[in-house]
Protein backbone atom coordinates (compact mmCIF):
# COMPACT_ATOMS: atom_id res chain seq x y z
CA UNK A 1 0.00 0.00 0.00
CA UNK A 2 1.19 3.52 -0.84
CA UNK A 3 0.64 5.73 2.21
CA UNK A 4 1.30 9.00 0.36
CA UNK A 5 -2.34 10.11 0.32
CA UNK A 6 -3.16 9.49 3.97
CA UNK A 7 -4.34 12.33 6.19
CA UNK A 8 -1.21 12.41 8.32
CA UNK A 9 -2.44 14.97 10.82
CA UNK A 10 -5.56 12.92 11.61
CA UNK A 11 -3.42 9.81 12.11
CA UNK A 12 -1.09 11.80 14.35
CA UNK A 13 -4.06 12.97 16.42
CA UNK A 14 -5.30 9.39 16.73
CA UNK A 15 -1.86 8.30 17.90
CA UNK A 16 -1.43 11.04 20.49
CA UNK A 17 -5.00 10.64 21.77
CA UNK A 18 -5.20 6.86 22.12
CA UNK A 19 -2.64 4.63 20.41
CA UNK A 20 0.32 6.02 22.36
CA UNK A 21 -1.38 5.21 25.66
CA UNK A 22 -1.98 1.61 24.55
CA UNK A 23 1.68 1.29 23.62
CA UNK A 24 2.65 2.59 27.06
CA UNK A 25 0.34 0.03 28.66
CA UNK A 26 1.90 -2.76 26.61
CA UNK A 27 5.40 -1.62 27.62
CA UNK A 28 4.56 -1.12 31.31
CA UNK A 29 7.24 -2.46 33.56
CA UNK A 30 9.89 -2.08 30.86
CA UNK A 31 12.66 0.48 31.26
CA UNK A 32 12.84 3.01 28.44
CA UNK A 33 16.56 2.33 28.14
CA UNK A 34 16.18 -1.43 27.84
CA UNK A 35 16.00 -1.47 24.05
CA UNK A 36 18.02 0.49 21.53
CA UNK A 37 15.96 1.90 18.65
CA UNK A 38 17.49 0.74 15.38
CA UNK A 39 14.54 1.02 12.98
CA UNK A 40 14.17 4.43 11.36
CA UNK A 41 12.12 6.09 8.64
CA UNK A 42 12.79 8.98 6.31
CA UNK A 43 9.38 10.56 5.78
CA UNK A 44 5.77 10.12 6.78
CA UNK A 45 4.68 7.58 4.13
CA UNK A 46 7.84 5.56 4.84
CA UNK A 47 7.16 5.73 8.58
CA UNK A 48 3.64 4.36 8.07
CA UNK A 49 5.03 1.57 5.89
CA UNK A 50 7.45 0.58 8.66
CA UNK A 51 4.76 0.95 11.34
CA UNK A 52 2.40 -1.29 9.39
CA UNK A 53 5.12 -3.90 8.89
CA UNK A 54 6.18 -4.02 12.55
CA UNK A 55 2.61 -3.95 13.83
CA UNK A 56 0.95 -6.52 11.57
CA UNK A 57 3.62 -8.78 10.09
CA UNK A 58 4.61 -11.74 12.29
CA UNK A 59 8.34 -11.89 12.96
CA UNK A 60 10.63 -14.48 14.49
CA UNK A 61 10.00 -14.43 18.22
CA UNK A 62 6.96 -12.16 18.01
CA UNK A 63 3.84 -13.40 16.28
CA UNK A 64 1.15 -11.78 18.41
CA UNK A 65 1.13 -7.99 18.07
CA UNK A 66 -1.75 -7.72 15.62
CA UNK A 67 -4.25 -8.74 18.30
CA UNK A 68 -3.15 -6.02 20.72
CA UNK A 69 -5.31 -2.98 21.41
CA UNK A 70 -2.75 -0.56 19.93
CA UNK A 71 -2.62 -2.64 16.75
CA UNK A 72 -6.38 -2.68 16.35
CA UNK A 73 -6.52 1.09 16.84
CA UNK A 74 -3.66 1.55 14.39
CA UNK A 75 -5.54 -0.51 11.83
CA UNK A 76 -8.68 1.53 12.41
CA UNK A 77 -6.83 4.82 11.99
CA UNK A 78 -5.20 3.69 8.77
CA UNK A 79 -8.52 2.39 7.47
CA UNK A 80 -10.23 5.72 8.18
CA UNK A 81 -7.53 8.14 7.08
CA UNK A 82 -5.76 6.29 4.25
CA UNK A 83 -7.95 6.02 1.12
CA UNK A 84 -8.28 2.44 -0.08
CA UNK A 85 -6.26 0.98 2.80
CA UNK A 86 -9.05 -1.29 4.05
CA UNK A 87 -9.40 -3.05 0.73
CA UNK A 88 -5.72 -3.95 0.64
CA UNK A 89 -5.88 -5.52 4.10
CA UNK A 90 -8.74 -8.02 3.69
CA UNK A 91 -6.59 -10.96 2.68
CA UNK A 92 -3.95 -10.10 5.27
CA UNK A 93 -6.57 -9.98 8.02
CA UNK A 94 -7.98 -13.39 7.11
CA UNK A 95 -4.50 -14.91 7.15
CA UNK A 96 -3.84 -13.26 10.50
CA UNK A 97 -6.97 -14.77 12.06
CA UNK A 98 -5.94 -18.24 10.94
CA UNK A 99 -2.42 -17.82 12.23
CA UNK A 100 -3.11 -16.88 15.84
CA UNK A 101 -5.53 -17.59 18.63
CA UNK A 102 -3.75 -16.20 21.71
CA UNK A 103 -1.66 -13.19 22.73
CA UNK A 104 1.80 -13.87 24.12
CA UNK A 105 4.13 -11.10 25.29
CA UNK A 106 7.76 -11.99 24.67
CA UNK A 107 10.93 -9.97 25.09
CA UNK A 108 11.16 -9.83 21.31
CA UNK A 109 7.66 -8.32 21.17
CA UNK A 110 8.61 -5.72 23.76
CA UNK A 111 11.65 -4.80 21.69
CA UNK A 112 9.48 -4.56 18.58
CA UNK A 113 7.00 -2.27 20.31
CA UNK A 114 9.89 -0.10 21.51
CA UNK A 115 10.90 0.24 17.85
CA UNK A 116 7.29 1.12 17.02
CA UNK A 117 7.34 3.95 19.55
CA UNK A 118 10.41 5.38 17.83
CA UNK A 119 8.76 5.16 14.42
CA UNK A 120 5.61 6.88 15.67
CA UNK A 121 7.73 9.59 17.31
CA UNK A 122 9.44 10.22 13.98
CA UNK A 123 6.12 10.16 12.11
CA UNK A 124 4.67 12.79 14.45
CA UNK A 125 7.60 15.20 14.38
CA UNK A 126 9.43 15.21 11.08
CA UNK A 127 11.79 18.14 10.78
CA UNK A 128 10.20 20.44 8.26
CA UNK A 129 11.66 21.86 5.11
CA UNK A 130 12.08 25.58 5.63
CA UNK A 131 11.52 28.09 2.86
CA UNK A 132 14.88 28.97 1.38
CA UNK A 133 16.56 26.00 3.03
CA UNK A 134 18.89 23.98 0.85
CA UNK A 135 20.26 21.49 3.35
CA UNK A 136 17.18 19.34 3.78
CA UNK A 137 16.83 15.97 2.08
CA UNK A 138 13.80 16.70 -0.10
CA UNK A 139 12.40 13.18 -0.18
CA UNK A 140 9.23 13.86 1.68
CA UNK A 141 5.54 13.81 1.04
CA UNK A 142 3.18 16.53 -0.04
CA UNK A 143 1.66 16.97 3.45
CA UNK A 144 5.04 17.61 4.98
CA UNK A 145 5.67 21.28 4.38
CA UNK A 146 3.02 23.07 6.36
CA UNK A 147 2.36 21.52 9.76
CA UNK A 148 3.83 18.95 12.13
Amino acid sequence: YDFTNCDFEKIKAAYLSTISKDLITYMSGTKSTEFNNTVSCSNRPHCLTEIQSLTFNPTAGCASLAKEMFAMKTKAALAIWCPGYSETQINATQAMKKARKSKVTTNKCLEQVSQLQGLWRRFNRPLLKQQGSSDYKDDDDKHHHHHH
Partner: antibody, heavy 120, light 111 residues
Framework: EVQLVQSGAEVKKPGSSVKVSCKAS????????MHWVRQAPGQGLEWMGA????????SYNQKFKDRVTITADKSTSTAYMELSSLRSEDTAVYYC?????????????WGQGTTVTVSS | DIVLTQSPDSLAVSLGERATINCRAS??????????MHWYQQKPGQPPKLLIY???NLGSGVPDRFSGSGSGTDFTLTISSLQAEDVAVYYC?????????FGQGTKLEIK
Protein backbone atom coordinates in the same frame (compact mmCIF):
# COMPACT_ATOMS: atom_id res chain seq x y z
CA GLU B 1 17.20 8.56 33.38
CA VAL B 2 18.19 10.52 30.29
CA GLN B 3 20.74 13.27 30.81
CA LEU B 4 22.21 15.88 28.48
CA VAL B 5 25.65 17.21 29.41
CA GLN B 6 26.99 20.22 27.56
CA SER B 7 30.53 21.47 27.05
CA GLY B 8 31.97 24.26 29.15
CA ALA B 9 31.79 28.03 28.90
CA GLU B 10 33.49 29.78 25.98
CA VAL B 11 34.88 33.27 25.45
CA LYS B 12 35.19 34.21 21.78
CA LYS B 13 36.27 37.16 19.65
CA PRO B 14 33.85 38.82 17.24
CA GLY B 15 34.00 37.20 13.82
CA SER B 16 35.14 33.83 15.15
CA SER B 17 33.16 30.61 15.57
CA VAL B 18 32.07 28.49 18.52
CA LYS B 19 31.13 24.82 18.65
CA VAL B 20 29.10 23.58 21.60
CA SER B 21 28.60 19.88 22.32
CA CYS B 22 25.74 18.05 24.01
CA LYS B 23 26.26 14.44 25.09
CA ALA B 24 23.24 12.26 25.80
CA SER B 25 23.35 9.36 28.23
CA UNK B 26 20.87 6.94 29.75
CA UNK B 27 18.62 6.45 26.74
CA UNK B 28 18.16 6.17 23.01
CA UNK B 29 19.72 9.03 21.06
CA UNK B 30 19.15 8.46 17.36
CA UNK B 31 15.33 8.53 17.21
CA UNK B 32 14.71 11.75 19.13
CA UNK B 33 14.83 15.24 17.62
CA MET B 34 17.53 17.27 19.36
CA HIS B 35 17.12 21.05 19.49
CA TRP B 36 19.23 24.07 20.30
CA VAL B 37 17.73 27.07 22.11
CA ARG B 38 19.57 30.17 23.23
CA GLN B 39 18.90 32.82 25.86
CA ALA B 40 20.64 36.19 25.88
CA PRO B 41 21.22 37.79 29.30
CA GLY B 42 17.91 38.87 30.80
CA GLN B 43 16.06 37.85 27.64
CA GLY B 44 13.68 35.12 26.54
CA LEU B 45 14.15 31.79 24.79
CA GLU B 46 14.99 31.63 21.09
CA TRP B 47 14.88 28.44 19.01
CA MET B 48 17.89 28.01 16.72
CA GLY B 49 17.33 24.67 15.04
CA ALA B 50 17.15 20.91 15.39
CA UNK B 51 18.55 17.64 14.12
CA UNK B 52 17.22 14.11 13.80
CA UNK B 53 20.34 12.03 14.56
CA UNK B 54 18.88 8.97 12.83
CA UNK B 55 19.69 10.42 9.42
CA UNK B 56 21.24 13.81 10.14
CA UNK B 57 18.24 15.74 8.87
CA UNK B 58 18.18 19.33 10.11
CA SER B 59 15.80 22.24 10.41
CA TYR B 60 16.94 25.79 11.18
CA ASN B 61 15.44 29.05 12.27
CA GLN B 62 15.90 31.28 9.23
CA LYS B 63 17.35 33.96 11.49
CA PHE B 64 20.42 31.74 11.98
CA LYS B 65 20.32 29.79 8.74
CA ASP B 66 23.55 31.16 7.26
CA ARG B 67 25.54 31.00 10.51
CA VAL B 68 24.48 27.89 12.38
CA THR B 69 25.34 24.26 11.68
CA ILE B 70 23.87 21.46 13.76
CA THR B 71 25.39 17.98 13.54
CA ALA B 72 25.22 14.74 15.48
CA ASP B 73 27.48 11.75 16.08
CA LYS B 74 25.42 8.64 16.74
CA SER B 75 28.46 6.65 17.84
CA THR B 76 29.02 8.95 20.81
CA SER B 77 25.39 10.10 21.26
CA THR B 78 26.52 13.69 20.92
CA ALA B 79 24.90 16.64 19.19
CA TYR B 80 26.85 19.74 18.16
CA MET B 81 25.91 23.34 17.40
CA GLU B 82 28.40 25.55 15.61
CA LEU B 83 27.74 29.27 15.28
CA SER B 84 29.98 31.31 13.01
CA SER B 85 30.65 35.01 12.40
CA LEU B 86 30.06 35.73 16.05
CA ARG B 87 28.96 39.17 17.18
CA SER B 88 28.43 40.68 20.61
CA GLU B 89 24.69 40.02 20.48
CA ASP B 90 25.43 36.27 20.30
CA THR B 91 26.49 36.43 23.95
CA ALA B 92 24.02 34.03 25.54
CA VAL B 93 23.43 30.73 27.28
CA TYR B 94 23.01 27.98 24.69
CA TYR B 95 20.86 24.99 25.61
CA CYS B 96 20.40 21.65 23.92
CA UNK B 97 17.05 20.00 24.51
CA UNK B 98 15.51 16.66 23.59
CA UNK B 99 11.96 16.25 22.38
CA UNK B 100 9.50 14.08 24.27
CA UNK B 101 8.85 10.36 23.81
CA UNK B 102 5.67 10.66 21.78
CA UNK B 103 6.18 13.41 19.24
CA UNK B 104 4.11 15.97 21.14
CA UNK B 105 6.80 18.54 20.38
CA UNK B 106 7.76 19.64 23.87
CA UNK B 107 11.21 19.49 25.45
CA UNK B 108 11.34 17.11 28.38
CA UNK B 109 15.12 16.94 28.86
CA TRP B 110 17.46 19.93 28.78
CA GLY B 111 21.19 20.34 29.02
CA GLN B 112 22.61 22.51 31.79
CA GLY B 113 23.45 25.29 29.34
CA THR B 114 26.71 26.62 27.92
CA THR B 115 27.59 30.27 28.37
CA VAL B 116 29.15 31.84 25.30
CA THR B 117 30.60 35.31 25.69
CA VAL B 118 31.56 37.29 22.60
CA SER B 119 33.88 40.13 23.42
CA SER B 120 36.80 41.91 21.83
CA ASP C 1 6.32 32.90 11.85
CA ILE C 2 3.76 32.48 14.63
CA VAL C 3 4.24 35.23 17.21
CA LEU C 4 3.32 34.38 20.80
CA THR C 5 2.45 37.34 23.02
CA GLN C 6 2.27 36.75 26.76
CA SER C 7 0.44 38.97 29.20
CA PRO C 8 1.24 40.39 31.57
CA ASP C 9 5.00 40.84 31.25
CA SER C 10 5.27 40.64 35.03
CA LEU C 11 2.89 39.67 37.78
CA ALA C 12 2.94 39.96 41.58
CA VAL C 13 0.61 37.65 43.49
CA SER C 14 0.22 36.96 47.21
CA LEU C 15 1.08 33.53 48.58
CA GLY C 16 -1.92 31.23 48.38
CA GLU C 17 -3.62 33.36 45.74
CA ARG C 18 -4.37 32.48 42.12
CA ALA C 19 -1.97 33.50 39.34
CA THR C 20 -3.04 33.63 35.70
CA ILE C 21 -0.79 34.07 32.68
CA ASN C 22 -2.10 34.42 29.13
CA CYS C 23 -0.53 33.56 25.80
CA ARG C 24 -1.99 34.71 22.49
CA ALA C 25 -0.79 33.31 19.16
CA SER C 26 -0.81 35.33 15.94
CA UNK C 27 -2.50 32.35 14.26
CA UNK C 28 -4.06 29.11 15.41
CA UNK C 29 -1.78 26.42 16.81
CA UNK C 30 -4.51 23.77 16.60
CA UNK C 31 -4.30 20.80 14.30
CA UNK C 32 -6.83 17.98 13.94
CA UNK C 33 -8.47 18.87 17.22
CA UNK C 34 -5.25 19.10 19.23
CA UNK C 35 -3.61 22.30 20.50
CA UNK C 36 0.16 22.25 20.18
CA MET C 37 0.95 24.78 22.88
CA HIS C 38 3.27 24.01 25.79
CA TRP C 39 4.24 25.88 28.97
CA TYR C 40 7.60 26.01 30.78
CA GLN C 41 8.87 27.37 34.07
CA GLN C 42 12.39 28.76 34.35
CA LYS C 43 14.15 29.66 37.57
CA PRO C 44 17.35 31.77 37.66
CA GLY C 45 20.44 29.86 36.54
CA GLN C 46 18.44 26.81 35.46
CA PRO C 47 17.16 25.48 32.15
CA PRO C 48 13.41 25.62 31.56
CA LYS C 49 11.21 22.87 32.96
CA LEU C 50 8.09 21.58 31.24
CA LEU C 51 4.85 22.34 33.12
CA ILE C 52 2.02 21.76 30.65
CA TYR C 53 2.00 20.05 27.27
CA UNK C 54 -0.56 20.27 24.53
CA UNK C 55 -2.43 23.13 26.23
CA UNK C 56 -3.87 21.26 29.22
CA ASN C 57 -1.86 18.14 30.08
CA LEU C 58 0.22 18.20 33.25
CA GLY C 59 3.90 17.36 32.81
CA SER C 60 5.49 14.54 34.76
CA GLY C 61 6.06 15.42 38.42
CA VAL C 62 4.36 18.83 38.11
CA PRO C 63 2.13 19.76 41.10
CA ASP C 64 -1.58 19.81 40.33
CA ARG C 65 -1.90 23.44 41.37
CA PHE C 66 -0.69 24.13 37.82
CA SER C 67 -3.23 23.87 35.03
CA GLY C 68 -3.55 24.95 31.42
CA SER C 69 -6.48 25.73 29.17
CA GLY C 70 -7.33 27.20 25.81
CA SER C 71 -7.38 26.38 22.13
CA GLY C 72 -6.83 28.04 18.79
CA THR C 73 -5.03 31.29 19.54
CA ASP C 74 -5.75 31.94 23.23
CA PHE C 75 -4.20 29.96 26.07
CA THR C 76 -3.95 30.35 29.83
CA LEU C 77 -1.64 28.99 32.50
CA THR C 78 -3.11 29.05 36.00
CA ILE C 79 -1.51 28.47 39.38
CA SER C 80 -4.40 27.88 41.77
CA SER C 81 -2.55 28.66 44.99
CA LEU C 82 0.81 30.37 44.65
CA GLN C 83 3.72 28.86 46.58
CA ALA C 84 7.09 30.50 47.26
CA GLU C 85 8.85 28.04 44.94
CA ASP C 86 6.68 29.16 42.01
CA VAL C 87 8.63 32.43 41.67
CA ALA C 88 10.06 32.13 38.15
CA VAL C 89 9.68 33.19 34.55
CA TYR C 90 7.00 31.34 32.57
CA TYR C 91 7.09 30.77 28.81
CA CYS C 92 4.58 29.45 26.31
CA UNK C 93 5.84 27.61 23.22
CA UNK C 94 4.13 26.55 20.01
CA UNK C 95 5.17 23.60 17.89
CA UNK C 96 2.40 23.51 15.30
CA UNK C 97 4.25 25.46 12.62
CA UNK C 98 7.96 25.91 12.02
CA UNK C 99 9.85 27.79 13.17
CA UNK C 100 9.13 26.77 16.72
CA UNK C 101 8.54 29.93 18.76
CA PHE C 102 8.35 30.98 22.42
CA GLY C 103 6.48 33.78 24.10
CA GLN C 104 8.56 36.62 25.54
CA GLY C 105 8.09 35.34 29.09
CA THR C 106 6.13 36.41 32.16
CA LYS C 107 7.96 37.09 35.41
CA LEU C 108 6.00 35.93 38.44
CA GLU C 109 6.84 37.39 41.85
CA ILE C 110 5.34 37.32 45.33
CA LYS C 111 3.38 40.38 46.45
Amino acid sequence: EVQLVQSGAEVKKPGSSVKVSCKASGGTFSTYNMHWVRQAPGQGLEWMGAIYPGNGETSYNQKFKDRVTITADKSTSTAYMELSSLRSEDTAVYYCAREDDYGEGYFDVWGQGTTVTVSS
Amino acid sequence: DIVLTQSPDSLAVSLGERATINCRASESVDNSGLSFMHWYQQKPGQPPKLLIYRASNLGSGVPDRFSGSGSGTDFTLTISSLQAEDVAVYYCQQINTDPLTFGQGTKLEIK
